[in-house]
């Protein structure tokens, strides 16, 4: 089966790569503006050059391309914790990411919000913070993971999960209550 | 203590709109970014939409781009999601909510109210 092809993807294999299949008269193929411009105009004939301009501060095009108008220029969430790491340029997009000892969390493709990285109190560090992923905590003997916290069994009720983990701590306390009833 | 009570929610034909409201209390509403979550039935949560304090640049999931728009009102401790050009897979049950703060998790949502966009 042959995959479907956009439009635009037709007329761009119909001509080697780097070249574009011209708008108005498919027999001419036009060479691709570089990353960092936009197409201004089309080429007026075969051999010869395609009009392509820088694209203005706050846009960019980050590869060569058939674009009649540069791209926006992202801007960091400041209320997401996001900070800027690099800043846009007429060929890269602006580059957003978090502060030392934090973490991205991806809510959907193109939003991410910082974070702490735990720090792992009342427990170990399995593993440690990485770019896209908080620390993973080990508990110590008496606590639960709970939020990514490790949390004392003291404040485990008996329809959480961590009843398993903190067993013998429900028991004593079960155990307590009922020495206390008369 | 917190409380956020979404309503507006119904049953509204293809095409439609509807106005969905929340009012905030138990907390300075101004000082928050607040959040419109989503979750379709056997579904998981989805981000929706969400505005800062002064109401600047307010994001949109892609999904939403260009029908919906969300807005709030600091003098009356109140958010809105104005849904334009509803879709049969806009349907779900919305929830508002305090921007997390200390991981992602909502520690304050709503209860909810849903939309059903059905002909």
């Known amino acids: 089966l042959v995959p479907h092809l956009g439009d635009r993807e037709k007329r761009d294999s119909v001509c080697p790569q780097g070249k574009y299949i011209h708008p108005q008269n498919n027999s001419i193929c036009c060479t691709k503006c570089h990353k960092g411009t936009y197409l201004y105009n089309d080429c007026p004939g075969p051999g010869q050059d395609t009009d392509c301009r820088e694209c203005e501060s706050g846009s960019f095009t980050a590869s060569e391309n058939h674009l009649r108008h540069c791209l926006s220029c992202s801007k960091c969430r400041k209320e997401m914790g996001q900070v800027e790491i690099s800043s846009c340029t007429v060929d890269r997009d602006t580059v957003c990411g978090c502060r030392k000892n934090q973490y991205r969390h991806y809510w959907s493709e193109n939003l991410f919000q910082c974070f702490n990285c735990s720090l792992c109190l009342n427990g170990t560090v399995h593993l440690s913070c990485q770019e896209k992923q908080n620390t993973v905590c080990t508990c110590h003997a008496g606590f639960f993971l709970r939020e990514n916290e490790c949390v004392s069994c003291s404040n485990c009720k008996k329809s959480l999960e961590c009843t398993k983990l903190c067993l013998p701590q429900i028991e004593n306390v079960k155990g307590t209550e009922d020495s206390g009833t008369t | 203590e917190v409380q956020l009570l979404e309503s507006g929610g119904g049953l509204i034909q293809p095409g439609g709109s509807l106005r969905l409201s929340c009012a905030a209390s138990?907390?300075?509403?101004?000082?928050?970014?607040m959040v419109w979550v989503r979750q379709a039935p056997g579904k998981g949560l989805e981000w929706v939409s969400h505005?800062?304090?002064?109401?600047?640049?307010?994001y949109y999931a892609d999904s939403v781009k260009g029908r919906f728009t969300i807005s709030r009102d600091n003098s009356k401790n109140t958010l809105y999601l104005q849904m334009n050009s509803l879709r049969a897979e806009d349907t779900a049950v919305y929830y508002c909510?305090?921007?997390?703060?200390?991981?992602?998790?909502?520690?304050?949502r709503g209860q909810g109210t849903l939309v059903t966009v059905s002909s």
């Open positions: 505005i800062d304090r002064v109401g600047q640049d307010p």
């Open positions: 909510a305090l921007l997390p703060k200390r991981g992602p998790w909502f520690d304050y």
């Open positions: 138990g907390f300075t509403f101004a000082h928050e970014t």
